[in-house]
């Protein structure tokens, strides 16, 4: 017996814009799209979306990014490097709502983390974050 | 505690693994005061491409 899987992809969150493979309906009350199974599907930098309204997303193709002569990480042909990052937040408690992007706890934590990374890597070159996953420490 | 796992994207050639980790670690104190997030056990690695959402979550259980 199996449940139903939703074919949506992870969102690359960056400063109000997002790049994602497939669109998914989002609630008007949330700052991020709400993929049902955002962790189940591959993420590709397939489109560049600017969120104007929770239910409408405008798309254009990703413009080619400037690439340098040496590589620092495996890249896309568009000139993007990806890094996997893991860390503990010791003063927060995990609970099951952190498995669901429609919950307040998930959204607040994702918002803080997204803002934090924009602050840390604001010197340029940072495109955003995706595939965010929370689990108990 | 909560473990956070995510993927960061940068323009090619603008940063390496060491600098990603260094800059993140340098910000930990400010993260605690600004966002009330006490961060520890930072780990950064390259993500091979093409990658899937599943493939890079296996190291940390």
């Amino acid at each position: 017996a199996s449940g139903s899987a939703s074919g949506s992809a992870s969102t690359l969150v960056h400063n109000g814009t997002s790049a994602r493979a497939t669109t998914t309906p989002a609630s008007k009350s949330t700052p991020f799209s709400i993929p049902s199974h955002h962790s189940d599907t591959p993420t590709t930098l397939a489109s560049h979306s600017t969120k104007t309204d929770a239910s409408s997303t405008h798309h254009s193709s990703v413009p080619p990014l400037t690439s340098s002569n040496h590589s620092t990480s495996p890249q896309l042909s568009t000139g993007v490097s990806f890094f996997f990052l893991s860390f503990h937040i010791s003063n927060l408690q995990f609970n099951s709502s952190l498995e669901d992007p429609s919950t307040d706890y998930y959204q607040e934590l994702q918002r803080d983390i997204s803002e934090m990374f924009l602050q840390i890597y604001k010197q340029g070159g940072f495109l955003g974050l995706s595939n965010i996953k929370f689990r108990p420490g | 505690s909560v473990v956070v796992q995510l993927t960061l994207a940068f323009r090619e050639g603008t940063i390496n693994v060491h600098d990603v980790e260094t800059q993140f670690n340098q910000y930990k104190t400010e993260a605690a005061s600004r966002y009330n997030l006490t961060i520890s056990d930072v780990s950064v690695s390259d993500v091979p491409f093409p990658f899937s959402a599943q493939s890079h979550h296996h190291h940390h259980h």
Partner: antibody
């Protein structure tokens, strides 16, 4: 395709315990949550608790605290629920439901537990 | 605990009919509400997550919406395979709770 396969039906005596399993397949993550829900004959659904597979993190409905134990075996991609001090009103179908980017995404077929002397 | 009051508890309808099922939440739950379908044999499937998002593989005749504390599941044109029992589920706060169910029967 994600599948959740639950263990077979059980007939148990009042006062005894029962342990059932929920095996997941078709999914490469080894870390996700499993919720347990029950449905008594002719009744609605009732949440029992939650476990994050591969950790000792659990949440329980107060109504079942002390009688329910949730455990998991990451290597076998299996979650377990043990219910003790069984009484006739525990006769029900017990479902597991796992997360997949959001809660209650996939459901098992259910395990019928009959408490009878 | 958050109470979900689901109505009607049962309804009779014909193939092609538009069917509406409502859940009212006793507290604010935002959009943290799912709709589930339970077939007569017992199998449970999620249809709608986060109030209005359709799970993949679920026909587009199913839709979810919200107005204040009222959450609605609509089946725009009932099909033979839709005769089942439907439940709402809130996951805003523990313990997670379900509506009492709506049995959709053939008229």
């Amino acid at each position: 395709e994600v599948q959740l396969v639950q263990s077979g039906a059980e007939v148990v005596k009042p006062g005894a315990s029962v342990k059932m399993s929920c095996k997941t397949s078709g999914y490469t993550f080894t870390s996700y949550g499993i919720n347990w829900v029950r449905q008594r004959p002719g009744q609605g659904l009732e949440w029992i608790g939650y476990i994050y597979l591969g950790s000792d993190y659990t949440e329980y409905n107060e109504k079942f605290k002390g009688r329910v134990t949730l455990t998991s075996d990451t290597s076998a991609s299996t979650a377990y629920m043990e219910l003790s001090s069984l009484r006739s009103e525990d006769t029900a179908v017990y479902y597991c439901a796992r997360s997949g980017g959001s809660l209650f995404a996939y459901w098992g077929q259910g395990t019928l537990v009959t408490v009878s002397s | 605990d958050i109470q979900l009051t689901q109505s009607p508890s049962s309804l009779s309808a014909s193939v092609g009919d538009r069917v509406t099922i409502t859940c009212r939440a006793s507290q604010d739950i935002g959009i943290t509400l799912n709709w589930l379908q339970q077939e007569p044999g017992g199998a449970i499937k999620r249809l709608i997550y986060a109030t209005s998002s359709l799970d993949s593989g679920v026909p587009k005749r199913f839709s979810g919406s919200r107005s204040g504390s009222d959450y609605t599941l609509t089946i725009s044109s009932l099909q033979p395979e839709d005769f089942a029992t439907y439940y709402c589920l809130q996951y805003a706060s523990s313990p997670y709770t379900f509506g009492g169910g709506t049995k959709v029967e053939i008229k």
